[in-house]
Amino acid sequence: IWELKKDVYVVELDWYPDAPGEMVVLTCDTPEEDGITWTLDQSSEVLGSGKTLTIQVKEFGDAGQYTCHKGGEVLSHSLLLLHKKEDGIWSTDILKDQKEPKNKTFLRCEAKNYSGRFTCWWLTTISTDLTFSVKSSRGSSDPQGVTCGAATLSAERVRGDNKEYEYSVECQEDSACPAAEESLPIEVMVDAVHKLKYENYTSSFFIRDIIKPDPPKNLQLKPLKNSRQVEVSWEYPDTWSTPHSYFSLTFCVQVQGKSKREKKDRVFTDKTSATVICRKNASISVRAQDRYYSSSWSEWASVPCS
Amino acid sequence: RAVPGGSSPAWTQCQQLSQKLCTLAWSAHPLVGHMDLREEGDEETTNDVPHIQCGDGCDPQGLRDNSQFCLQRIHQGLIFYEKLLGSDIFTGEPSLLPDSPVGQLHASLLGLSQLLQPEGHHWETQQIPSLSPSQPWQRLLLRFKILRSLQAFVAVAARVFAHGAATLSP
């Protein structure tokens, strides 16, 4: 058993049929010595008396808010949550496996630049009685500070018969050094509590590996005289690290016909313009990627050819 | 070239070669996630590689003030990786074909380090750890870790030379 926060405790249980469970001793936080009784949740049934209560925690029915009273007055509470371990593996019932970039990916994170700011998100089908708490650091043995905000519900989607809820959190490294080569990964830890179930999820990454620039901005076309060619131009996204002579991007320009089956013409360039042939009913799209490190491409910025 | 008196390197040449290094490093080990290398036991592996750290003056301001600190750090790293890529970590099994980008990577690391340090001038170099794994799986794991680490190192070096070529070239 360990303390998650004040008056909230997590009991770690090996979860299998007829498991013996864990013996837990609760102590009433009071100077009083006698006349103390204990109850669980809203029930008025007295579970025991005395300053301490010993219970055998085996299942969710044994978890909940234990309260000690004296003469009708509440003295203190202890909320017991369960953390299940099945076949040596901690349960992951609360969050959905996003399976990208690999199986058992529950947290996904992205950064728009090298400033040390990043966003993580996760998915669940649970809509109520759900709380999250997020902590982060750079490195684990001698951790350096990363400050995370509160997790918020950022999207709701309907998937088949189910509703899916996306939560996200923003974090900022306290003393970020955008130009340095990271040697210690960022660690993100999410505590999830659904009713009386506790689970924790972690992710470990370098900012450089989760970089995904915003799409290029101000995408414009300039027809070239007496030609089917156009000059496409664009700018670095506002959110990208500066100076651009140091934090450089590379770009992919694509001409795509109306039908998805039509052949795509692609050009790669380090410049912020390119000359391409504009076909009727086609569109021109540009996306960006760090020039020197192959992290994710941005989403496409697009304009119609006409 | 970064000569003893502290004059400028051939920024544009360094820029071109460092960008080629980035491409080669990703050709040699293109996959980011086919195995989570940090999960695979980090004890004596690549913790000793020289990293370009915050105080090494490789940021735009530091380069403007005095690029020598940064160039020395980059040179140190290039020599370190060049020695690793020439070691039995890369020559033993699993077998690399002669067309492997590792060969070109090795030659290009040497080429860039020579651009930075002409003959007769010696910056101190970091000792390369004596890693000689006997099993193919240990060697392969180490290869992947070294290449992932090299990708990060050459990305910073390439940014330095791109910025230098754009803002510090005579």
Partner: antibody, heavy 120, light 107 residues
């Protein structure tokens, strides 16, 4: 896109020789090794060897040394595999293939195969 | 030479079944193992490399696992178009060697 086109099927007498060609296109011929494999009827694959056109250096499976000669003609982007002293057990489909660019020998592109039949 | 012992040599399964083919290397090959699919009269097609990395365009029902000496190719839900021969291949050590193949049929 990368393509490997092999010469047509051959029927040969025991003791004779055969030269199979593999014309490459869609990439820089001198940049990559070209490998040869064979597959006897109803059998698995056997790796014969490769040539690296850039330095014209072949490497052979010891089991095929003296039996096989692998060469390359840079001017036509073509690799060749010559089999000598043919015996009935050399009857097989012979494939050329090129590996991944990362320098390890898993094979992405294959020729269509050339059936060599050795029969008296 | 490294021997790649592949089993079973043939197997018959129903559409939707989970199918597993194994390969045992005679010594440590790290994860330098690829798997190929060869349909009758066709050339081998790369499915998996580095023991578990799916090649571009290969359906997600194909997966590979294993390291050092023991390797597995799994088809999570067999489809009619998966009827073929399957080969494992080690590229750790010269001469590169292949398993003897597994002929997969639909019941």
């Amino acid at each position: 896109q990368v393509q490997l086109v092999q010469s047509g099927a051959e029927v040969k007498k025991p003791g004779s020789s055969v030269k199979v060609s593999c014309k490459a296109s869609g990439y820089t011929f001198t940049d990559q090794t070209i490998h040869w494999m064979r597959q006897a009827p109803g059998q698995g694959l056997e790796w014969i060897g490769y040539i690296y056109p850039r330095d014209d250096s072949p490497k052979y499976n010891e089991n095929f040394k003296g039996k096989v000669t692998i060469t390359a003609d840079i001017s036509t982007s073509t690799a060749y595999m010559e089999l000598s002293s043919l015996r009935s057990e050399d009857t097989a489909v012979y494939y050329c293939a090129i590996p991944d660019r990362s320098g390890y020998a898993w094979f992405i592109y294959w020729g269509q195969g050339t059936l060599v039949t050795v029969s008296s | 030479d490294i021997q790649m012992t592949q089993s079973p040599s043939s197997l018959s399964a129903s559409v939707g079944d989970r199918v597993t083919i194994t390969c045992k290397a005679s010594r440590d090959v790290a994860i330098a193992v690829a798997w190929y699919q060869q349909k009758p009269g066709k050339v081998p097609k790369l499915l998996i490399y580095w023991a578990s990395t799916r090649h571009t365009g290969v359906p997600s029902r194909f997966s590979g696992s294993g390291s050092r000496t023991d390797f597995t190719l799994t088809i999570s839900s067999l489809q009619p178009e998966d009827v073929a021969d399957y080969f494992c291949h080690q590229y750790s050590s010269y001469p590169f060697t292949f398993g003897s193949g597994t002929k997969l049929e639909i019941k």
